[in-house]
Amino acid sequence: GQNITARIGEPLVLSCKGAPKKPPQQLEWKLNTGRTEAWKVLSPQGGPWDSVARILPNGSLLLPATGIVDEGTFRCRATNRRGKEVKSNYRVRVYQIPGKPEIVDPASELTASVPNKVGTCVSEGSYPAGTLSWHLDGKLLIPDGKETLVKEETRRHPETGLFTLRSELTVIPTQGGTHPTFSCSFSLGLPRRRPLNTAPIQLRVREPGPPEGIQLLVEPEGGIVAPGGTVTLTCAISAQPPPQVHWIKDGAPLPLAPSPVLLLPEVGHEDEGTYSCVATHPSHGPQESPPVSIRVTETGDEGPAEGSVGESGLGTLA
């Protein structure tokens, strides 16, 4: 049999070998495609199938506009002028070239030694699905799962049957000061079909700088809290990737799992003291925040407020 590749929406003519070019002809076309469940023999007189597959006067079969459901096998059996039976067999596959792929949400720059999302390559409207590949400085990037990570997603349109492909590239550049060029290409995997390439993006790789300051936020403001209240300490740091955060109380590390938030519920006097957080960045040493003081007091330092509950538990008014 012969393999035929046809573009979706385009006409396709399959010739019936051995068939006389003009009637009278003895021929039979049958097909097994997404429109059939088994073999469908086409009527030489024509009929409802003519909109998808029509026998022409010369015995050829015309598919006016090939679709995904027309993929399959087409066979013609003809008797030539000498009375010999001649068979033609075609395996038809269809394709659709998508629009030019695009890199969406590209990074503005990259930071050395840490994972960076380069961007997401998107291709819309392909059939079959095809593949997306990333290139670095013109060379194919092979994802290794460590320095080069690719996250892929394929979706199929419920009505058209065409595919949308997405590929998200994350890299860990080894050194700063370079200007790598990334591009993405789509390939259908069909012979004689060149890949479609995105416009390249050139990114600057900077060395990871020290975190731009570290702040310790306290809630309630001022760090004064009544017994049984809750204190929330938040270590705010503008570093990427987020560093590990440990906590210190009165100069001693607290035996807690690293976390940028320290929650002190139902505080008592034993929770009073000076707190700070220490951020440890992979490429830099530890950085400590300015300290904050936590004080546990009934109603502050001014003495009982007017209308407060006295020792007797009764409300008193001055």
């Epitope: 469940e37 088994a38 469908k40 007189q45 199938w49 003519d50």
Partner: antibody
């Protein structure tokens, strides 16, 4: 909204002629095959003629072949049925329907026009 | 030519009943069968296309099924507005053939 409106029905003598029209709106007319279906009084539905979207190919059952001609004018979004040599058994309500090929059969129908063949 | 033998030709049923109408094709027509509903003095309305697919705007109590050359229209719970005549149509081969119709009447 898809609309099909038939016209041209009436009383005609046996052996006479009549031309039915169907005005289509609400869809891209030249993307669809079109069909005429009839229904004799108190009887079932019978396929009369179909035409492909370009108008190049027409199809008929033996009962009307060589007497009826289906045609279309895509510029006017109109479908026609020229009926010649009419017989008493052609008396029916004639419906215009969208479709007729394997992609969807018939999905929309007009309200019908009555043709009465009687002396 | 293909024959579409529809049965029963008429039936009496009550509101809420489950109703089944069958068409048998004299030869293989694939899934190229439609079902229509027709009320007196009105044009047919498509209910089911390609044997099993519910047409737009048709209530889900209507369903179509197929077993070889046997096609079935089922109304799961008959409603007052469902009393009408139902037709099947094969559109796999010319001449296109309708079933003889099934009139669903109130018991």
């Amino acid at each position: 909204e898809v609309q099909l409106v038939e016209s041209g029905g009436g009383l005609v003598q046996p052996g006479g002629s009549l031309r039915l029209s169907c005005a289509a709106s609400g869809f891209t007319f030249n993307n669809y095959w079109m069909t005429w279906v009839r229904q004799a009084p108190g009887k079932g539905l019978e396929w009369v003629a179909s035409i492909d979207n370009s108008g190049d190919n027409t199809y008929y059952p033996d009962s009307v072949k060589d007497r009826f001609t289906i045609s279309r004018d895509n510029a006017k979004n109109s479908l026609y049925l020229q009926m010649n040599s009419l017989r008493a058994e052609d008396t029916a309500v004639y419906y215009c329907a969208r479709g007729g090929d394997i992609t969807n059969g018939f999905d929309y129908w007009g309200q019908g026009t009555l043709v009465t063949v009687s002396s | 030519d293909i024959q579409m033998t529809q049965s029963p030709s008429s039936l009496s049923a009550s509101v809420g009943d489950r109703v089944t109408i069958t068409c048998r094709a004299s030869q293989d027509v694939g899934f190229y069968v439609n079902w229509f509903q027709q009320k007196p003095g009105k044009a047919p309305r498509r209910l089911i296309y390609r044997a099993t697919n519910l047409a737009d705007g048709v209530p889900s109590r209507f369903s179509g099924s197929r077993s070889g050359t046997d096609f079935t229209l089922t109304i799961s719970s008959l409603q007052p507005e469902d009393f009408a005549t139902y037709y099947c149509l094969e559109f796999d081969e010319h001449p296109l053939t309708f079933g003889g119709g099934t009139k669903v009447e109130i018991k």
